[in-house]
C-alpha cells in the first residue's frame, strides 16, 4: 500500500516522493533497500535526499531500484517504499506505454491536460507542449500555468501530449519530460425546460379571410436525446384531433439539430379557409419534456386588404 | 380532489399479461405524465415507465423493455399499464403516480410524484 | 442510471428527537440550468401508496408537517424529523427525477426506540 512506482530517463531530473506523508517538521531518512545504506542529503551528489523527497540530478539507468523512506516523529516510525526505474532515451519518436502518465479526457467546455508530477519540481514558465512529438502551434494551444488548453477541442485532439520544463537546483539546470495520454469525449447530452423559439408570447398573427394560414410552434429541449419531448397546438385549451374542426389539422415538421446541438421540434397548424370564426379562437404552442409544460399564446386577426386608390 | 383510481387485484398465470387501468379525476390529464412504479413483497420501489398522455410518449425502463406497454385514453381520462410474460418475479403491488407541478398561467415546472393510486396487486402463480 | 444509496437501513429514534435519513446519488442530480437539484423524498406506511414530502431537494410539499425539512446539493442529501412523533413510523425513499431511468434509494426503516 505505501509502495510508489516512478519512472524517468537517463539525463534528466526525477524528483520521487516518500508515499508516506507526516507534517514538515518531521525528520524523513532515505535508503537504498538492497544495501541498506543511508542516501546522503548533501546536494553536491548526485542522487540526494531532501526531506520528503529524493532527488536524481540527474538520473542514471544505474538508479534504478527500490528505496525506502522512513518518516520519524517523536511518536512512530513510518515506513514507505519508492520503486525507481530510469529508462534510455527512446531514439524514436514513440513514447512506450511504461512512461506514460495517467489519461486525461476532455470536452468542448474542458480541455485542461496537467504536466505531470510537476509540482514536485523547481520550475519556471513557460512549458513546452508537444503532441505526438511535434511542438504545439497556433492560437488554439495555450500554455498557462502548469496545464494546455486546447480550444474547442476536436476529435482529432486526441493523442500523446508531452510537456517538457528546466528544474533549476542551486543555479544548475536539468530538463524533465513528461508524457500522458488525451482522450476526446462527446459532451453528454442534457435537457432544458423548453424553450419555444416560435411564436412570440402573446404574438398576433395577421390572416386574411378565405386564405390557407401556418402558425409554427417552435421549441428546443436541450442537446443530444431527449426523453418525452413534444410540441403541440391547442384550439381553446383542446386538443387539435378532439376539437372537431377538420379545417385546422397539425403537422408534425422536422426534428431539427442545430449546429450548435440543439434537439429542437417543430408542429406546424394549417389552417384552410379562414373564417371569421377562427379570429375568436385562443390558439396555444405547447412545448414540454420531463421538465416542464411552456405555453405560448396566439391570436389570429384580419388582414386588412392593400386600398388602391388612383 | 385530485385523484387516481387503479383497477382491482389480479391473479394470473406465468407466461400471460396484465392490463393494469389507473382512472384520473379532478385535474386536466393532458397536461401531466403519469409514471408507473412497482413494488415487490418487502422490497423497495422500482420505476417501470412513463407516459406524457397528449402526445402519447413513452420511455420505459430498460428492464421492462419490451414487455411492457404504457397507454393513456384522453377521453376517459384513463393511463394503462399492460405487462407481458408475466413471471413469479412480477408479483407485486403496481402504483401509477402523477407527475408534481408547479403551475403558472404559461409554465408547469414538474417534480417527483405527487399523487399516487392506491395500487392493484397483481399475483402470478401457477 | 443513477444508483441513489440511502443510509442507514434502519433507524430506532425516541419520539421527540431528532430522525436524520442520509441519501446518496451516484452522480450529480443538479441541473446547473436552473440551479435545482431534481431530488425527492416519499413516506410510505404499511398498505398504503407513497406520499410526496419534499421535492427539488428541500421543497415541502403542501399539507407536510413542517417538523420534515430537506436539504443537501449534488450528490448528497438529507431529510431530518426534527421531533419524531408516532405517526412518522414508516419506510423512506429519495428518489432522483435529474434523468431516466428514474430511481429510487433502498429505503430507510424509522421505528420508535
Known amino acids: 500500500k505505501f509502495s510508489k512506482q516512478s519512472w524517468g530517463l537517463e539525463n534528466e531530473a526525477l524528483i520521487v516522493r516518500c508515499p508516506r506523508q507526516g507534517k514538515p517538521s518531521y525528520t524523513v531518512d532515505w535508503y537504498y533497500s538492497q544495501t541498506n545504506k543511508s542516501i546522503p542529503t548533501q546536494e553536491r551528489n548526485r542522487v540526494f535526499a531532501s526531506g520528503q523527497l529524493l532527488k536524481f540530478l540527474p538520473a542514471a539507468v544505474a538508479d534504478s531500484g527500490i528505496y525506502t523512506c522512513i518518516v520519524r516523529s517523536p511518536t512512530f516510525n513510518r515506513t514507505g517504499y519508492a520503486n525507481v526505474t530510469i529508462y534510455k532515451k527512446q531514439s524514436d519518436c514513440n513514447v512506450p506505454d511504461y512512461l506514460m502518465y495517467s489519461t486525461v479526457s476532455g470536452s468542448e467546455k474542458n480541455s485542461k491536460i496537467y504536466c505531470p508530477t510537476i509540482d514536485l519540481y523547481n520550475w519556471t514558465a513557460p512549458l513546452e507542449w508537444f503532441k505526438n512529438c511535434q511542438a504545439l502551434q497556433g492560437s488554439r494551444y495555450r500554455a498557462h500555468k502548469s496545464f494546455l488548453v486546447i480550444d474547442n477541442v476536436m476529435t482529432e485532439d486526441a493523442g500523446d501530449y508531452t510537456c517538457k520544463f528546466i528544474h533549476n537546483e542551486n543555479g544548475a539546470n536539468y530538463s524533465v519530460t513528461a508524457t500522458r495520454s488525451f482522450t476526446v469525449k462527446d459532451e453528454q447530452g442534457f435537457s432544458l425546460f423548453p424553450v419555444i423559439g416560435a411564436p412570440a408570447q402573446n404574438e398576433i398573427k395577421e390572416v386574411e379571410i378565405g386564405k390557407n394560414a401556418n402558425l409554427t410552434c417552435s421549441a428546443c429541449f436541450g442537446k443530444g436525446t431527449q426523453f418525452l419531448a413534444a410540441v403541440l397546438w391547442q384550439l381553446n385549451g383542446t386538443k387539435i384531433t378532439d376539437f372537431g374542426e377538420p379545417r385546422i389539422q397539425q403537422e408534425e415538421g422536422q426534428n431539427q439539430s442545430f449546429s450548435n446541438g440543439l434537439a429542437c421540434l417543430d408542429m406546424v397548424l394549417r389552417i384552410a379557409d379562414v373564417k371569421e370564426e377562427d379570429l375568436l379562437l385562443q390558439y396555444d404552442c405547447l412545448a414540454l419534456n420531463l421538465h416542464g409544460l411552456r405555453r405560448h399564446t396566439v391570436r389570429l386577426s384580419r388582414k386588412n386588404p392593400i386600398d388602391h386608390h388612383s | 380532489q385530485v385523484q387516481l383510481v387503479q383497477s382491482g387485484a389480479e391473479v394470473k398465470k406465468p407466461g400471460s399479461s396484465v392490463k393494469v387501468s389507473c382512472k384520473a379525476s379532478?385535474?386536466?390529464?393532458?397536461?401531466?405524465?403519469i409514471h408507473w412504479v412497482r413494488q415487490a413483497p418487502g422490497q423497495g420501489l422500482e420505476w417501470m415507465g412513463i407516459?406524457?398522455?397528449?402526445?402519447?410518449?413513452?420511455t420505459y425502463a430498460q428492464k421492462f423493455q419490451g414487455r411492457v406497454t404504457i397507454t393513456a385514453d384522453e377521453s376517459t381520462s384513463t393511463a394503462y399499464m399492460e405487462l407481458s410474460s408475466l413471471r413469479s418475479e412480477d408479483t407485486a403491488v403496481y402504483y401509477c403516480?402523477?407527475?408534481?407541478?408547479?403551475?403558472?398561467?404559461?409554465?408547469?415546472?414538474?417534480?417527483?410524484?405527487?399523487?399516487w393510486g392506491q395500487g392493484t396487486t397483481v399475483t402470478v402463480s401457477s | 442510471d443513477i444508483v441513489m444509496t440511502q443510509s442507514p437501513d434502519s433507524l430506532a429514534v425516541s419520539l421527540g428527537e431528532r430522525a436524520t435519513i442520509n441519501c446518496k446519488s451516484s452522480?450529480?442530480?443538479?441541473?446547473?440550468?436552473?440551479?435545482?437539484?431534481?431530488l425527492a423524498w416519499y413516506q410510505q406506511k404499511p398498505g398504503q401508496p407513497p406520499k410526496l414530502l419534499i421535492y427539488?431537494?428541500?421543497t415541502r410539499e403542501s399539507g407536510v408537517p413542517d417538523r420534515f425539512s430537506g436539504s443537501g446539493s449534488g450528490t448528497d442529501f438529507t431529510l431530518t424529523i426534527s421531533s419524531l412523533q408516532a405517526e412518522d413510523v414508516a419506510v423512506y425513499y429519495c428518489?432522483?427525477?435529474?434523468?431516466?431511468?428514474?430511481?429510487f434509494g433502498q429505503g430507510t426503516k424509522v421505528e420508535i426506540k
Open positions: 403516480a402523477r407527475v408534481g407541478a408547479t403551475v403558472t398561467k404559461n409554465y408547469y415546472y414538474y417534480y417527483g410524484m405527487d399523487v
Open positions: 379532478g385535474y386536466r390529464f393532458t397536461d401531466y405524465y
Open positions: 407516459i406524457q398522455p397528449t402526445g402519447g410518449g413513452t
Open positions: 452522480q450529480s442530480v443538479l441541473y446547473s440550468s436552473n440551479n435545482r437539484n431534481y
Open positions: 427539488w431537494a428541500s
Open positions: 428518489q432522483q427525477y435529474y434523468s431516466v431511468p428514474l430511481t
